[in-house]
């Protein structure tokens, strides 16, 4: 079997819904010494980057500027050290917002209720559209999705207080092309007052934090390695 | 706004060479990844040859060792140096750039591009 190296890390800088025109940013992390990067795009070569000095560098960034929906889709990444390549990355969905216009949310029975009661959210978008997505602010990898003409509803079920929060709708024209969002409507989930002080709202972690990891390895530590590597020897 | 006009095409014997100019206007210049593409008649617009705002290049199977893209930031200039041309050289070439850019990325895709050229022709027949 042909040899390969292990896949790297693909990861949106920030986020991976990147409003039309402006700059999405894309982190390949591979390995130390991989000569080049490649940035694939619906199974096609998009970019190539060559980090100097390789041997310094674990990943690179690729940059995708003035963001529209012919750039919106799947990416994946590989990298070579020397003629050897690496498998495919995961792939990556990139989405483009803030297309045509912009919907309305709204929560029946209220944006206030009480844990145990049944919540519905309602999207609505005039324009031609048949699908709709509902994301919670800090969790937009989670993203729930519904259709209808104008108007798509969200059943939530009986909420618990682990639903608070601020939530967001889109439409979309299709899975990578995605309206202005909403207004965000914030509920408000009480729940039973001896619980109410030990039920804190479901932590959200926000986007943000999915940035690039990526290292750039410095002498020192190289003479360390080196050193640990000649002390290992010489206690042999 | 970009603009970006090609010059030095025309007709060629196969095996000569041809040097293909790009202009660009703006001061944008030194941070736009370059790039040069090609159509041949009743086929689609295909990659020939890109260089990264840090000269880094990157070139099509097709052209590679018979092709060379260089730029000249002083002069707004990018450049295809094309030699041992054959008869599937044939075809319009276009001037591509992706403003503004960052770091050292060598755009091949097309739709990475934001800027384009008219095309020049180039013509390789004997």
């Known amino acids: 079997p042909k040899q390969t190296l292990p896949k790297p890390i693909i990861r949106a800088e920030s986020t991976y819904m990147v409003p039309k025109e402006k700059q999405a940013t894309l982190c390949c992390q591979g390995s130390y010494g991989a000569v080049e990067y490649q940035l694939h795009f619906e199974g096609s070569l998009f970019a190539v980057e060559r980090p100097k000095p390789p041997e310094r560098i674990n990943g690179v960034k690729f940059h995708i500027p003035d963001m529209n929906s012919r750039k919106a889709g799947r990416y994946s990444c590989i990298y070579r050290v020397g003629e050897l390549w690496s498998e495919r990355s995961d792939l990556l969905d990139l989405v483009v917002t803030e297309m045509y216009d912009t919907p309305t949310l709204s929560v029946h029975p209220g944006p206030e209720v009480t844990s145990g009661e049944k919540v519905t959210f309602y999207c609505r978008l005039d324009t031609a559209t048949s699908m709709f997505l509902l994301l919670k602010e800090g969790r937009s990898r989670d993203v729930q999705r519904s259709y209808g003409k104008v108007q798509a509803e969200f059943p939530m079920g009986p909420v618990t207080t682990a639903h608070r929060g601020s939530y967001r709708c889109f439409g979309s024209y299709n899975n990578y092309a995605w309206s202005f969002p909403s207004e965000p409507v914030k509920l408000l989930v009480t729940g039973d007052i001896e619980n109410t002080s030990l039920a804190p709202t479901d932590p959200t972690f926000p986007d943000s934090w999915d940035t690039c990891l990526l290292t750039r390895e410095t002498g020192l530590q190289k003479d360390l390695a080196l050193w640990d590597h000649t002390a290992q020897n010489l206690l042999r | 706004e970009v603009q970006l006009v090609e010059s030095g095409g025309g007709e060629v014997q196969p095996g000569g060479s041809l040097r293909l100019s790009c202009a660009a206007s703006?001061?944008?210049?030194?941070?736009?990844?370059m790039g040069w593409f090609r159509q041949a008649p009743g086929k689609e617009r295909e990659f020939v040859a890109a260089i990264s705002r840090s000269d880094d290049t990157y070139y099509a199977d097709s052209v590679k060792g018979r092709f060379t893209i260089s730029r000249d930031n002083a002069k707004n200039t990018v450049y295809l140096q094309m030699s041992s041309l054959r008869a599937e050289d044939t075809a319009v070439y276009y001037c591509?750039?992706?403003?503004?850019?960052?770091?050292?990325?060598?755009?091949?895709?097309?739709?990475?591009?934001?800027?384009w050229g008219q095309g020049t022709l180039v013509t390789v027949k004997p």
């Open positions: 703006g001061r944008t210049f030194a941070s736009a990844a």
């Open positions: 591509a750039a992706v403003v503004p850019t960052y770091g050292s990325n060598i755009y091949v895709y097309s739709a990475a591009y934001n800027y």
